[in-house]
């Protein structure tokens, strides 16, 4: 083993791994053929000048998660092999011009979730074949212009969970083979016009988490070959008409978690291969017609958590693939019977905390493929003869949480549940909310005899009784239904191990999230 | 006649937590949504929480997300609310409220007479 | 969704006609409450729905107002009627009230 430190492991003689608190400097000697290195959870504070000297045959070095705050300029000489550096879980506030001179084979250098407070152009000047730089995690509050000219080779740069307040548009100008940008959890609040123009080869750029509240035109023209834009979580409250429009390898798009109050039609566009489309939680309050008309191969799109009061009949026109349509908690009363016309292809829909007070009958007409429908916390008292007939494949349909009136016209609904029973699930059943002597009896087995004949009443109030709010105390309690809850809170998959917690109801569709870079 | 009657509240400090309770009489508990409304000392009224009639759907306000959880039993016509991680300015008079309808409304046709929550050191 | 009363208080005497309004900073369409309360009670409901009278409540109460100006007028103030008045809206989550209006009697 040409002489393994006793602190250490050489499972083979080129791989050494030196771990524990007992460590505080480099062990010594080390193998000198030893071609991958780890220096792991040890209480080393400072690498001196070349203390890899004798292992000029490294090809990976890894210095994790130690107390190192100081790095002398000639630790890593000699390394001439080296291609894969990782400084990454330290205390490194400062790196020394000229740490990384004499690597001329470094195509990794990892230098996140450390303290740095700045870099500058000379300390990656000599890196001229890196590939990947990872700078997330440490505390850079701007990018000197020039910092990474020297780095045409780069393909990968993480910046995120920074304090960058602003980019320069001049800093990525030389970056032509980079695909991956990473800009995430900073504190940025806009980003100039031309910053990405010469990223020609991007194919992610992560912005999500930031502050940002305007996006300029033509900010991603230059990048055609963009397969994932992650802008979620800014105070984006407006789209420029543009802004989607050269970005046809798009494939994923989120926009959750802004300001969004409107969609102006062919905004998404065209885009042949996205398939999930991410709005939930912004301030959106109408859809037009034809706004998603453009992306004729989305599969999921999440409206949710919005302040959506009307939809008009042809906004889903060409979304002819969609499977997945999350409407919920928004505040509809009303949808016109053709809107959801186009959706050949939906299996599950999701309408329920809304203020829906009916349904029109041919509602579901054409999504004869319906697998689940989630109607609970509305405000329905009654359903259209027929409405759920043709929908063979429907296997869940949640009811609940509405006020049902349980007078004659009730009737041919609750002989539909009785027969299908089944696809109500069996922890949470609709019960009648009026008349009040049959208030909380099941709507499935309540004796039709007991409710009073039908009374038509005005629309407002909904609730028709002597008065919407009658005192009930001369009413003895009946039926009570035991409390389930049907939220759940998945969490979303970030590329780079950042993680968001959202509430979308998603569980009940059994799919996965990873939304954001 | 309806009553609500809360219950649960005290002094706690910062970073502590407190349930409240909420015993409903005299409606059929299971078919009205119910919400919690506190309110400061000399300020407004501050809504918190709702929860539907089966307990399927909940909602809070921005400031309690993570900490507050609603929830209900309607076998024993019960609303609580599980405070953790406590705040001065969680410190408030918490009223329990009864909903108009099933559904999650904003419209309370009967409130408790509130039990007092204090965060402090 | 931030509610805004006005006036923050007013003064007036037995049988004046009273006027409180609450503005929206977003259309809620009319999806609002009014809420009465007087010192060391709980609140009361006195309309919903922007312009529907809760059951009880007298009919000297009445809304209007759609999107994003509401009024609550008492047509002829009572003595019982001296307290401090919310609107409410539950529009969109989370729910919020305005900031209050207290009615005084006037000396």
């Known amino acids: 083993y040409y002489g393994c430190p006793s602190e250490c492991t050489c499972s083979r003689a080129s791989q050494v791994e030196c771990t524990g608190a007992r460590i505080v400097a480099v062990p010594t000697p080390l193998p000198w053929n030893a071609m991958s290195l780890q220096i792991l959870n040890t209480h080393i504070t400072e690498l001196s000048e070349s203390p890899f000297l004798n292992i000029s045959a490294l090809i990976a070095l890894r210095i994790e998660k130690n107390e190192l705050s100081h790095i002398m300029p000639g630790a890593f000489r000699n390394l001439g092999s080296l291609r894969y550096l990782s400084l990454a879980n330290n205390k490194l506030q400062v790196l020394p011009i000229g740490l990384f001179q004499g690597l001329d084979s470094l195509e990794s250098l990892l230098l996140s979730s450390n303290q740095l407070v700045q870099i500058q152009p000379a300390h990656f000047s000599q890196c001229s074949n890196l590939k990947e730089l990872q700078l997330h995690g440490n505390h850079l509050e701007y990018i000197p212009d020039g910092a990474f000219d020297h780095l045409v080779g780069l393909t990968k740069l993480n910046l995120g969970k920074n304090s960058l307040t602003h980019i320069s548009p001049r800093v990525f100008q030389h970056l032509g083979n980079l695909q991956v940008l990473r800009l995430y959890e900073n504190r940025l609040t806009d980003i100039p016009m031309g910053t990405f123009d010469g990223l020609v080869n991007l194919q992610e750029l992560a912005l999500q988490q930031n502050q940002i509240g305007l996006l300029s035109p033509g900010l991603f023209h230059n990048n055609h070959n963009l397969q994932r834009l992650y802008l979620s979580n800014n105070h984006i409250s407006q789209l420029p008409p543009s802004i989607f429009m050269q970005l046809p390898q798009l494939n994923r798009l989120t926009l959750f978690g802004n300001s969004l109050k409107e969609l102006s039609p062919g905004i998404f566009g065209p885009m042949p291969n996205l398939r999930e489309l991410w709005l939930y939680d912004n301030h959106i309050t109408s859809l037009p017609d034809n706004v998603f008309s453009n992306l004729r191969q989305l599969q999921v799109l999440i409206l949710s958590r919005n302040q959506i009061s009307f939809i008009s009949p042809g906004a889903f026109n060409g979304l002819t693939e969609l499977r997945e349509l999350s409407l919920h908690t928004n505040a509809l009363q009303d949808l016109d019977g053709n809107v959801f016309r186009m959706l050949a292809n939906l299996q599950n829909i999701s309408l329920q905390n809304n203020r829906l007070r009916q349904l029109p009958g041919n509602i579901f007409a054409n999504v004869n493929g319906l697998m689940t429908i989630q109607l609970q916390n509305n405000q329905l008292e009654n359903l259209p003869l027929g409405i759920f007939d043709h929908l063979g494949k429907l296997c869940e349909l949640r009811l609940y949480d509405n006020p049902w009136r349980c007078d004659s016209d009730i009737l041919p609904l609750r002989n539909w549940l009785l027969l299908n029973q089944p696809r109500l699930g069996t922890d949470t059943v609709p019960v009648c909310f009026s008349p009040a002597n049959v208030r909380g009896q099941s709507l499935i087995i309540i004796n039709v005899n007991v409710a009073v004949p039908s009374v038509h009443v005005p629309e407002v109030p909904s609730y028709p009784e002597t008065s919407w709010y009658p005192d009930t105390s001369s009413y003895p309690d009946t039926t009570s239904i035991s409390s389930t809850t049907e939220l759940t809170s998945p969490v979303e998959d970030y590329t780079d191990l950042t993680t968001i917690q959202v509430t979308d109801d998603r569980s009940v569709w059994g799919m996965t999230q990873a939304q954001s870079g | 006649q309806v009553q609500l009657l809360e219950s649960g509240g005290g002094l706690v400090q910062p970073g502590g937590s407190l349930r409240l309770s909420c015993a409903a009489s005299g409606f059929t508990f299971s078919t009205f949504a119910m919400s919690w409304v506190r309110q400061a000392p000399g300020k407004g009224l501050d809504w918190v929480s709702v929860i539907s009639g089966t307990g399927g759907s909940t909602f809070y306000t921005d400031s309690v997300k993570g900490r507050f959880t609603i929830s209900r039993d309607n076998s024993e016509n019960t609303l609580y609310l599980e405070m953790n991680s406590l705040r001065a300015e969680d410190t408030a008079v918490y009223f329990c409220a009864k909903a108009v309808t099933v559904n999650t409304r904003g419209f309370f046709d009967y409130w408790g007479q509130g039990t007092l929550v204090t965060v402090s050191s | 969704i931030v509610l805004t009363q006005s006036p923050s208080s007013l003064s007036a005497s037995v049988g004046d006609r009273v006027t409180i309004t609450c503005r929206t900073s977003?259309?809620?369409?009319?999806?609002l409450g009014w809420y009465q309360q007087k010192p060391g009670k709980a609140p009361k409901l006195l309309i919903y729905d922007a312009s529907s009278l809760q059951s009880g409540v007298p009919s000297r109460f009445s809304g209007s107002g759609s999107g994003t100006d509401f009024t609550l007028t008492i047509s002829s103030l009572q003595p019982e009627d001296f307290a401090t008045y919310y609107c409410l809206q539950d529009n969109n989550y989370p729910w919020t009230f305005g900031q209050g209006t207290k009615v005084a009697i006037k000396r």
């Open positions: 977003q259309v809620i369409r009319n999806d």
